[in-house]
């Protein structure tokens, strides 16, 4: 049983090899098979892996860049997740999130179709504030620390990719 499980895992890892030649794996529990991996040098939090892309690109190119690596622009589900992510961000930069408002009607959507929950949003005060700024970034404001802002999708920014851990 353990052999077939390992074979399955190895074939799954081969899929990732093209873009992630090296993985960092950690033991999740006491059993030898309870390990999880993230591509090196991605960081891990709970069941996901994160990568900060420092190339300046539009939202569409940023999402494309993440998807090529088997990921999406980041979807933030909890305050704890955001607190983890910001540890790796630079205060003088802005980073695209996987959040957009395609219709310009303030109907925000996450790239992975996770329902947008108003109660778990971290907009800076007064944001979002422009109907033609339909993509979201996370940035630092001295008055409010880290929060979200709406921005034109075609303005190049850094970005954050997120993918499920490899088990």
């Amino acid at each position: 049983f353990m052999y077939s499980k390992t074979v399955k895992r190895l074939s799954k890892l081969r899929e990732y090899q093209q873009y992630h030649p090296s993985l960092t794996c950690v033991m999740e529990g006491k059993d030898i098979e309870d390990w999880s991996c993230c591509p090196t040098p991605w960081t891990s939090f709970q069941s996901s892996c994160y990568f900060i892309s420092t190339g300046m690109q539009s939202w569409t190119k940023s999402q494309k860049n993440c998807s090529v690596m088997g990921a999406d622009l980041v979807v933030i589900n909890t305050r704890e997740e955001q607190d983890f992510i910001i540890q790796n961000l630079k205060r003088n930069s802005s980073y695209f999130l996987g959040l957009s408002d395609p219709g310009g009607r303030r109907h925000w959507q996450w790239v992975d179709q996770t329902p947008y929950n108003e109660n778990v949003t971290f907009w800076h005060s007064g944001e979002p504030n422009n109907l033609d700024e339909r993509c979201a970034i996370i940035n630092f404001r001295s008055s409010e620390e880290w929060g979200w802002n709406d921005i034109h999708c075609h303005v190049p920014q850094k970005s954050i990719c997120k993918m499920k851990k490899i088990y």
Epitope: S58, T60, G103, H154, P156
Partner: antibody, heavy 123, light 111 residues
Framework: QVQLVESGGGLVKPGGSLRLSCAAS????????MSWVRQAPGKGLEWVSY????????YYADSVKGRFTISRDNAKNSLYLQMNSLRAEDTAVYYC????????????????WGQGTLVTVSS | DIVMTQSPDSLAVSLGERATINCKSS??????????MNWYQQKPGQPPKLLIY???TLESGVPSRFSGSGSGTDFTLTISSLQAEDVATYYC?????????FGGGTKVEIK
């Protein structure tokens, strides 16, 4: 109907300043991102700057960064371009243009343009 | 910056004949099957006028003899049957990523 009317162009010496205005009518000005685009005599089109609908975000071409400032007054339906430290290569017809977004706001086209105002920088 | 290269620089076409203008971008300007490619017409002494957006969508009021096609990095503007009033310079533009950039223009004349 949508109308954009530029004014403020003229002859100015190198190093001088000029302020262009664009008066908008026929649409809800405060809902649109606006651009300045220029065209040197006999040459092609070059984007200069744009400003978000609320005025909070501004963007500039590298060639004018630090010298030009875009602003708007939504109460007056007006767009402005303050041009300082002017150079001979800034000589052009300056157009204001409205952004119209498509494909879910990812992209835009400049769907309405003014007639333009000529700026000549010469000693 | 994304560089837009138009060809030819100028084009002489007989009335009623087809005119084809090409535009090549230095990087793809597509996402999810949509293109951020626009085409403008500029007649002498006039401002540019939007003809086509999203590579192939005709702006309201533009005659159907104008059409746009292409994806990725290669795009084409076609005038199926040239009319006298089509004498102008035509520009392509991408708005995928700032700064928005224009092609150098193609001047269309009557042969």
């Amino acid at each position: 109907q949508v109308q954009l009317v530029e004014s403020g162009g003229g002859l100015v010496k190198p190093g001088g300043s000029l302020r262009l205005s664009c008066a908008a009518s026929g649409f809800t000005f405060s809902s649109y991102t606006m651009s300045w685009v220029r065209q040197a005599p006999g040459k092609g089109l070059e984007w200069v700057s744009y400003i978000s609908s609320g005025g909070g975000n501004t963007y500039y071409a590298d060639s004018v960064k630090g010298r030009f400032t875009i602003s708007r007054d939504n109460a007056k339906n007006s767009l402005y371009l303050q041009m300082n430290s002017l150079r001979a290569e800034d000589t052009a017809v300056y157009y204001c243009a409205r952004h119209d977004y498509y494909d879910g706001g990812l992209y835009y086209a400049m769907d309405y343009w003014g007639q333009g105002t000529l700026v000549t920088v010469s000693s | 910056d994304i560089v837009m290269t138009q060809s030819p620089d100028s084009l002489a076409v007989s009335l009623g004949e087809r005119a084809t203008i090409n535009c090549k971008s230095s990087q793809s300007v597509d996402y999810d099957g949509d293109s951020s490619m626009n085409w403008y017409q500029q007649k002498p002494g006039q401002p540019p006028k939007l003809l086509i957006y999203a590579a192939s969508t005709l702006e309201s009021g533009v005659p159907s003899r104008f059409s746009g096609s292409g994806s990725g990095t290669d795009f084409t503007l076609t005038i199926s049957s040239l009319q006298a009033e089509d004498v102008a310079t035509y520009y392509c533009q991408q708005t995928n990523e700032d700064p928005p950039t224009f092609g150098g223009g193609t001047k269309v004349e009557i042969k």
